[in-house]
Each structure stands twice: as structure tokens, then as C-alpha cells.
């Protein structure tokens, strides 16, 4: 069967919009369908429609198409907002320019080049002709509009109403003449939808024929509408992915506007005395590099040849020999007049200390009002107003809406680990932003670390499974396998979630890992009845510097006599010094004939100050770390134990209070172990479990 062409690229999309007919005489056709693509194909082919389809609305809620013989420019029609609707208008009917010879032109120009009114196509007066609408179906020979049904050289034409002039071409400009851009077109938001060789552009919201990362919802500021040419990545000019499977992308032919001025929104903040950000908007007159060597003129090729000319970088103000940053370097620079020194930075220009350029936060960042809008993994933040429902789901007070503007990184839920944002990516609903605490900010996020202010245990008794107390059971221990070998430990804290260490994932390919649960022997010998082997579906990295990972299992573990979860401590709690705790692991034991059985080492909690003294003052512990020393000299965690838990008991309840991470040596005599303090990250763990989707059992 021949593959039907996807025609949705021929439509202009207006999200959350529908058309309401004021004129009751206007017809509409509706039908249940699955996708907007199906609506588009039917509209383009006019299949089974009693009119020429000019637009359609896809009702996402009812999965329904509404086809129209009119569009938003027609009389007797008005646009209306509607969450569940997307309006698609055939571009041919709303364009006021032509592509190539204008064969597809379906606009409403009806006057010839010399100003004569066109004769209607259905009329034989004053000129008889054979161009009847019935003979040229699909060519839209409507009214007296200019058309080019045969794709002739001169472009759209018509028979004229002047008996002396049989026909004449119409003066409809080429789209490439109408469309123009400033600079390299990063701010271009025009309607050019084909490349310089005439290939039709692929829609930005489609992944066929070419998969790409420029998803409109990920980059709300890039103007990824329909399939129009754009320049999201600093190319020399706008481009698009093409519908040709063999040509991934091509530039578009968009000329530079005669009046090459930029909109206010495109201009980096202009400064003359200091540098804002990377200094792309610096327009001052400093003309030497940091050590006093004079700059070469931008329009000169001596002593250094270059392409950073005023002609090539029209909007970058490359006047005289002033320091500038036309290419997104770290700061303003110039070519130098010293033949031996090609370029130099003008780092003597001071930085503007402007508060809205904040790139650090104080405390936990709940008052951060900077304008960063990207997560630490590079995802563009999604608008706060689209995510209020999700936000209300995990906070129990009304967030300050005045702070939640645009898609800027914020901290509306008092997260201990700084500003964050929603992403619009269903796999990573939210993430932290790459902002650090301001230098010298000592505001603690948890107070009184070494004094038991908050109890770690929830006030409930030990859990019982099938009537058997699990106090001696270690069913929450997980063996993380890398390429079929044990690599690390972990703790099952929820049926689908394992808490472990970041360093346990040398490969980014999740197919390399498995989680073994319910085992006592590292090789699973004798554990066949109780062993559960689960794949890993996602890694969620902890806050910056935490060394933690929450590992999502591909399906939930089945809790039974051999597999159980372990409790988390209360956020910010402290456990009294000398509390007896244990570390568990299948790691290096120092024995040559290691039997592969799960080992336990008994430790006791030590205050951070005393711990630092035991490390001869070389280590300063912070609020995110917890210390425990061995009762037996030289016992403690080592290679293969990383990711595993430090388990303590309070009020007869066992909890994972620490996670074993590398970097503090293996069970060194008289040196207590330093672990990641789980209580410090407890809110983060709960927030992930609450907001990330998990498969149902």
C-alpha cells in the first residue's frame, strides 16, 4: 500500500483556539478521529466533504475533527479560546505571497499587475475560456481570484474585466521577497516554510522524517510554530528540518530587511560603562585589551585576517576598534594590533552589578528572583502557570504567584536544595537549576545538627509482614548489577525506588544494569525462591553535590518475607551520639576466600565535630553528612558496599540514615566513616516519589 503523504505541514496551527460561525448559513462537517494528522489529510484531499476545506479544528478531548469551508479571515466567523481545541488553517488560503510559480496560491488578490479587475472564472464575459472551476478541481478557481492552475512561468494571473486585455499576471510578491530578517535571524518569526532549494519544512512538533531535540514545548521562546524557518542555535541564518528523508536540514532563503533594525526584545541589555552577563550588549569605547595593547579595527584585515567584519555581523556594532562580543565569547574582546597576539579579552571593563542578573541564591533560594530558566540538565523550564495543579499537589499552602512569573527558576515549596522548575518533559517532571548559593552565604538550611531536636523515627512501631516481625530481615538490601556482576549496594525505600550512590552508574546505558532483591548470597546461590531480578528504568540524580541517586525500577518489587522496604528518617532530624547502627554490603572483605554472603559491620553515631577530630582536622563535615565509627577496629564499608545503607534504630524502628559513598577510604582504623546524611535529603526523596510516575504492578 502506498504511504499517504502527511499534509499537516500545509497548515498553520493556533493552539487552544476554535472558530465559531456567526453566519448560520456556513457549513461544517464533523467526525471522530484519533489525530490531527488524519483531519489534515482529509481536509487537503477534500475527501467526502461537501465543500472546499480551508481549515479544521481538532478537538483533543472528544477526539473529533471539525472541517470548515472558511478560515479565521472569512466574514461571519470569529476566533474563540478553548483549551481542548487546536485550529489548523490551510496556509495556501491565508498567504499573501507565492512560492515558486504560485501554483498553490489560493489567496484573495483579484487585481492584475496594471490594476485591472479580474473576470470571474465561472463567467464567459468579456472573455470566453476553458478554465472552468469544474475542469480544474483542486485549483480553487473561485470568484475572480488570481490563480496559476497550470503552473506557468509568470505566476498567478486572471482573465481581465477589460475586453481589450484578455489576461494579465497579478502582482503577487514571492514569499522570499516579503519575508525578511535582521542580523542572523535569531529573532525571525515570519512564515517562510520551505528551504532555499524549495523543500517543504518539517513541523517542529513532529519527529518524522527527522528526529530532533527542538520541541516547541521545550523551547517556548524559540518561536517553533508549525514548520516555519527558525534559527534557534546561532546558525548564520534561519533553517528547518525538511520533509525529504535524505536531507535532514537546509537553510531558508530569507533576505535581510532593508531597515536592519532589531526589535527591543532581541537586543541584549546595552551598556556602555560595564559588562552585563557576557557583555554581548557592551557598546562602550574601551579599545585596548586587558594589558593595554590597542585593538585592531574590525573593518581591517591587518595584522590579523578574520571574518568578524561589520558586514558579517551587522547588529553587533563592530565600530572602530572597540571591544565587543559578537560571537558569544566569555566577555568582550578584540583582535590586537600586535602581530604576535591575535586576540585578547578586554577584562579590565568592570561587571555591572545588576540585581536582575542574579546567578546565585541565599539560604535555600526561596527569594531568588533571577531570570535563569533552564534546568541543570539543560532542559528549558516550562511556564509556572501551566503547572499550578502539580504544585498544589505537593505543597499545602498557596504559593506566592507574584514570584512565579514566566518560566524562571524559583523555589515556591521551600525546597532545601535551591531553585527549581517544571520541565514539560514527562520523564523528568521537574529538576533543579544550575545556580549556586552565593559565596559567603552561611545561612544554614537545617539548624542544630548535633542536638536531637527532631526525632528521626516516625512515631509508629516496627512493621510486621505476614505476622512475622521483619526486625532481623534485611529484605530492603539491593544488589545493583553492572553487566551481570555486583557493583554496589542500595536500599529499597518504596516498591519502585532504590536509594543508592551516583558513582554506582559508570555507564549511561540503563540496559547495563539490573537490581537483585531478596538475596543473601551475592551470586544468588540458594536464593532462587526468594530472588527478584528487576530492570532499571530511570536514574534521578540528587541535588548537586549530594552523590545520591534514586533508581526507578522497571516494575515494582513484590513485597514478601524476603523483600521489604526500609523507612526514611524525618527531614532534618538528628540521631543521638553513640546510637548503634549497622552498615551492610557484599563488598571487599579483606578475606581471600570471601564467601559472597551479605556482611554487616556495627558502627555507632559520632557527632560531626568529634568525627572531624578523628580525621585529624583534615575533614570538615557539613549538614549533609553523618559520621559513624566502628566498634571493631578496621571494620566498615569498602569497595562493593558503595550505595548501601547505614541503618539505625530509634523507637524500635529501623531507618536508612546514611548512604555509603566513595572518597573517604576503606574501613581505616580509628577513622570513622562519613556517609551522606539521608535526613538532609529526605524532602527531596519524598518529592521525587510523589511527582515522578512509576509503573503499576
Amino acid at each position: 500500500q502506498r504511504k499517504r503523504r502527511n499534509t499537516i505541514h500545509e497548515f498553520k496551527k493556533s493552539a487552544k483556539t476554535t472558530l465559531i460561525k456567526i453566519d448560520p448559513a456556513l457549513k461544517i462537517k464533523t467526525k471522530k478521529v484519533n489525530t490531527a494528522d488524519q483531519c489534515a489529510n482529509r481536509c487537503t484531499r477534500n475527501k467526502g466533504l461537501p465543500f472546499t476545506c480551508k481549515a479544521f479544528v481538532f478537538d483533543k478531548a472528544r477526539k473529533q475533527c471539525l472541517w470548515f469551508p472558511f478560515n479565521s479571515m472569512s466574514s461571519g466567523v470569529k476566533k474563540e479560546f478553548g483549551h481542548e481545541f487546536d485550529l489548523y488553517e490551510n496556509k495556501d488560503y491565508i498567504r499573501n505571497c507565492i512560492i515558486g510559480k504560485g501554483r498553490s496560491y489560493k489567496g484573495t488578490v483579484s487585481i492584475t499587475k496594471s490594476g485591472i479587475k479580474c473576470q470571474p472564472w465561472s463567467s464567459m464575459i468579456p472573455h470566453e475560456h476553458s478554465f472552468l472551476p469544474s475542469s480544474y478541481r483542486g485549483k480553487d478557481l473561485q470568484e475572480n481570484y488570481c490563480r496559476n492552475p497550470r503552473g506557468e512561468e509568470g505566476g498567478p494571473w486572471c482573465f481581465t474585466s477589460n475586453p481589450e486585455v484578455r489576461y494579465e499576471v497579478c502582482d503577487i510578491p514571492q514569499c522570499s521577497e516579503v519575508e525578511c530578517m535582521t542580523c542572523n535571524g535569531e529573532s525571525y518569526r515570519g512564515l517562510m516554510d520551505h528551504t532555499e532549494s524549495g523543500k517543504i519544512c518539517q513541523r517542529w512538533d513532529h519527529q518524522t522524517p527527522h528526529r530532533h531535540k527542538f520541541l516547541p514545548e521545550r523551547y517556548p521562546d524559540k518561536g517553533f510554530d508549525d514548520n516555519y524557518c527558525r534559527n534557534p542555535d546561532g546558525q548564520p541564518r534561519p533553517w528547518c528540518y525538511t520533509l525529504d528523508p535524505h536531507t535532514r536540514w537546509e537553510y531558508c532563503a530569507i533576505k535581510t530587511c532593508a531597515d536592519n533594525t532589531m526589535n527591543d526584545t532581541d537586543v541584549p541589555l546595552e551598556t556602555t560603562e560595564c559588562i552585563q552577563g557576557q557583555g554581548e550588549g557592551y557598546r562602550g569605547t574601551v579599545n585596548t585589551i586587558w594589558n593595554g595593547i590597542p585593538c585592531q579595527r574590525w573593518d581591517s584585515q591587518y595584522p590579523h585576517e578574520h571574518d568578524m567584519t561589520p558586514e558579517n555581523f551587522k547588529c553587533k556594532d563592530l565600530r572602530e576598534n572597540y571591544c565587543r562580543n559578537p560571537d558569544g565569547s566569555e566577555s568582550p574582546w578584540c583582535f590586537t594590533t600586535d602581530p604576535n597576539i591575535r586576540v585578547g579579552y578586554c577584562s579590565q571593563i568592570p561587571n555591572c552589578d545588576m540585581s536582575h542578573g542574579q546567578d546565585c541564591y541565599r539560604g535555600n533560594g526561596k527569594n531568588y528572583m533571577g531570570n535563569l530558566s533552564q534546568t541543570r540538565s539543560g532542559l528549558t523550564c516550562s511556564m509556572w502557570d501551566k503547572n499550578m495543579e502539580d504544585l498544589h499537589r505537593h505543597i499545602f499552602w498557596e504559593p506566592d504567584a507574584s514570584k512565579l512569573n514566566e518560566n524562571y527558576c524559583r523555589n515556591p515549596d521551600d525546597d532545601a536544595h535551591g531553585p527549581w522548575c517544571y520541565t514539560g518533559n514527562p520523564l523528568i517532571p521537574w529538576d533543579y537549576c544550575p545556580i549556586s548559593r552565593c559565596e559567603g552565604d552561611t545561612t544554614p538550611t537545617i539548624v542544630n545538627l548535633d542536638h536531637p531536636v527532631i526525632s528521626c523515627a516516625k512515631t509508629k512501631q516496627l512493621r510486621v509482614v505476614n505476622g512475622i516481625p521483619t526486625r532481623t530481615n534485611i529484605g530492603w538490601m539491593v544488589s545493583l548489577r553492572y553487566r551481570n556482576k555486583h557493583i554496589c549496594g542500595g536500599s529499597l525505600i518504596k516498591e519502585s525506588w532504590v536509594l543508592t550512590a551516583r558513582q554506582c552508574f559508570p555507564s549511561r546505558d540503563l540496559k547495563d544494569y539490573e537490581a537483585w532483591l531478596g538475596i543473601h548470597d551475592v551470586h544468588g546461590r540458594g536464593d532462587e525462591k526468594c530472588k527478584q531480578v528487576l530492570n532499571v528504568s530511570q536514574l534521578v540524580y540528587g541535588p548537586e553535590g549530594s552523590d545520591l541517586v534514586l533508581m526507578k525500577l522497571a516494575r515494582p518489587a513484590v513485597l514478601d518475607d524476603f523483600v521489604s522496604t526500609i523507612d526514611l528518617p524525618n527531614y532534618g532530624c538528628t540521631i543521638p551520639e553513640k546510637t548503634s547502627c549497622s552498615v551492610y554490603g557484599w563488598g571487599y572483605t579483606g578475606l581471600i576466600n570471601y564467601d559472597g554472603l551479605l556482611r554487616v559491620a556495627h558502627l555507632y553515631i559520632m557527632g560531626n565535630e568529634k568525627c572531624s577530630q578523628h580525621h585529624r582536622g583534615k575533614v570538615t563535615l557539613n549538614e549533609s553528612e553523618i559520621c559513624a565509627g566502628a566498634e571493631k577496629i578496621g571494620s566498615g564499608p569498602c569497595e562493593g558496599d558503595y550505595g548501601g545503607p547505614l541503618v539505625c534504630e530509634q523507637h524500635k524502628m529501623r531507618m536508612v540514615l546514611g548512604v555509603i559513598v566513595p572518597g573517604r577510604g576503606c574501613a581505616i582504623p580509628n577513622r570513622p566513616g562519613i556517609f551522606v546524611r539521608v535526613a538532609y535529603y529526605a524532602k527531596w526523596i519524598h518529592k521525587i516519589i510523589l511527582t515522578y510516575k512509576v509503573p503499576q504492578s
Epitope: Y482, C488, Q503, P506, D509, D512, G640, P662
Partner: antibody, heavy 119, light 110 residues
């Protein structure tokens, strides 16, 4: 100064063994994943082996079973033990620091040591 | 296992030219790709990491792009110092891998 210095290269007969060392200064080898990369005369770069912070290792198929990567934290040194050497193992061997504790790009290289396998 | 294919293997260009080198991964590696420059007798030097991030001290004429399986290293205006061999390297996974590097592209004077 942060640097890596390789040693232990030289001429060895086919089937013979050699141990390369890489002494690190200015940082701790156990805090980073560390790797060996080689380059045969006139050829491209070929990754050989890596040891991660947690002690796990990975090898290129050409090195598996014959080469062993290890480190001595007390000496701040990385090693590559090469057994059953073949003529095709002739190359400059570079020691390289991985940017992270897990697999990633290399942000520090040694100057290289030449290993020649020939009878 | 992941294979890295670089093209072209040799490229002749003149000072001032815009030069583009491509690297293809046999499976998606997201943005986990690095580019290195190597001159004869020297160790490689990191230029770009995570597909598009410029390593410190690297001139801004070098840029990287791409994600998934297709990646590009661009030198906007070739300088005399840029004649060298360039390698891509996947930073995604080395479990069961023959080589993490591409075959290299030698940029020589036209």
C-alpha cells in the same frame, strides 16, 4: 601542578608482559575515573581500559582478558598490566583522567609512553 | 556496542574557511559526545564536551552541535593553528565497546 606522567614503556617480545605506571600529581586518582588510551604509529586513538571511582573496571574488546587496570591510592598511581603482548599492541599509551567518577570525557592527559612489541 | 564513525577522514581547507566535521554514533548517545584536537607527537586536547560545551581556554571559533546519533564540530574561520587531527569520543558507555573514539579527521592545508 595538576599532571599525569606515564612510565614503564619499552621494547618487549611477543607473548611478553609489561606494566605501565601513571603517577598523578595535584589531584587524587581515587576521586576520578582513570583510563588508558593508546595510539598505534600513524593511526587513530583507541580506548583501552577504565577504572571507576567505585573500583569497577571496563576494557575494550582488544584488551579484555590480557590487560588489567588498577590503582594504588597510597601512591596516587594508576597501572596497566599487559600480558600476552602482540605486535598490534605497539603504540603510544596515554594515561587520561576522566572528568567524572563515571564514564565521561577526558580532561587531562599524560605525555604518553611508547610500547614496542617486536621480536 | 556503540561504534563511532567520523567523516571525512581527510579534509583540505584554507585559512579563513568554515570547516565542518561530522561524527555518527551507531545508537543514540544523547548529548554525551566530546571532541579533541591532536597535533603530531602531542597528547590530545579537549575542545568540546557534552556535544556543544566549549572546554575552557578553547577559542570560540570552535563549536559543537547535535544530539542522538549525529554530531558536528565546526570551525567558523580556520586559523593556521587549527591544522591538526580531530577525534570524537562517546561519553555514554563503554560496556562491550571496541573503541570509544571515532577514526579521526585530518585537517590539512589546501
Amino acid at each position: 601542578e595538576v599532571q599525569l606522567v606515564e612510565s614503564g614503556g619499552g621494547l618487549v617480545q611477543p607473548g611478553g608482559s609489561l606494566r605501565l605506571s601513571c603517577a598523578a600529581s595535584g589531584f587524587t586518582v581515587s576521586a576520578y575515573a582513570m583510563s588508558w588510551v593508546r595510539q598505534a604509529p600513524g593511526k587513530g586513538l583507541e580506548w583501552v581500559a577504565v577504572i571507576y571511582v567505585i573500583g569497577a573496571t571496563d576494557y575494550a574488546s582488544s584488551a579484555k582478558g590480557r590487560f588489567t587496570i588498577s590503582r594504588d591510592n597510597s601512591k596516587n598511581t594508576l597501572y596497566l598490566q599487559m600480558n600476552s603482548l602482540r605486535a598490534e599492541d605497539t603504540a603510544v599509551y596515554y594515561c587520561a583522567r576522566v572528568y567524572d567518577s563515571v564514564w565521561n570525557h577526558f580532561n587531562l592527559w599524560g605525555q604518553g609512553t611508547l610500547v614496542t612489541v617486536s621480536s | 556496542d556503540i561504534q563511532m564513525t567520523q567523516s571525512p577522514s581527510t579534509l583540505s581547507a584554507s585559512v579563513g574557511d568554515r570547516v565542518t566535521i561530522t561524527c555518527q554514533a551507531s545508537q543514540s548517545i544523547s548529548s554525551w559526545l566530546a571532541w579533541y584536537q591532536q597535533k603530531p607527537g602531542k597528547a590530545p586536547k579537549l575542545l568540546i564536551y557534552q556535544a556543544s560545551k566549549l572546554a575552557s581556554g578553547v577559542p570560540s571559533r570552535f563549536s559543537g552541535s547535535g544530539s542522538g546519533t549525529e554530531f558536528t564540530l565546526t570551525i567558523s574561520s580556520l586559523q593556521p593553528d587549527d591544522f591538526a587531527t580531530y577525534y570524537c569520543q562517546q561519553a555514554y558507555s563503554v560496556s562491550n565497546v571496541d573503541n570509544a573514539f571515532g577514526g579521526g579527521t585530518k585537517v590539512e592545508i589546501k
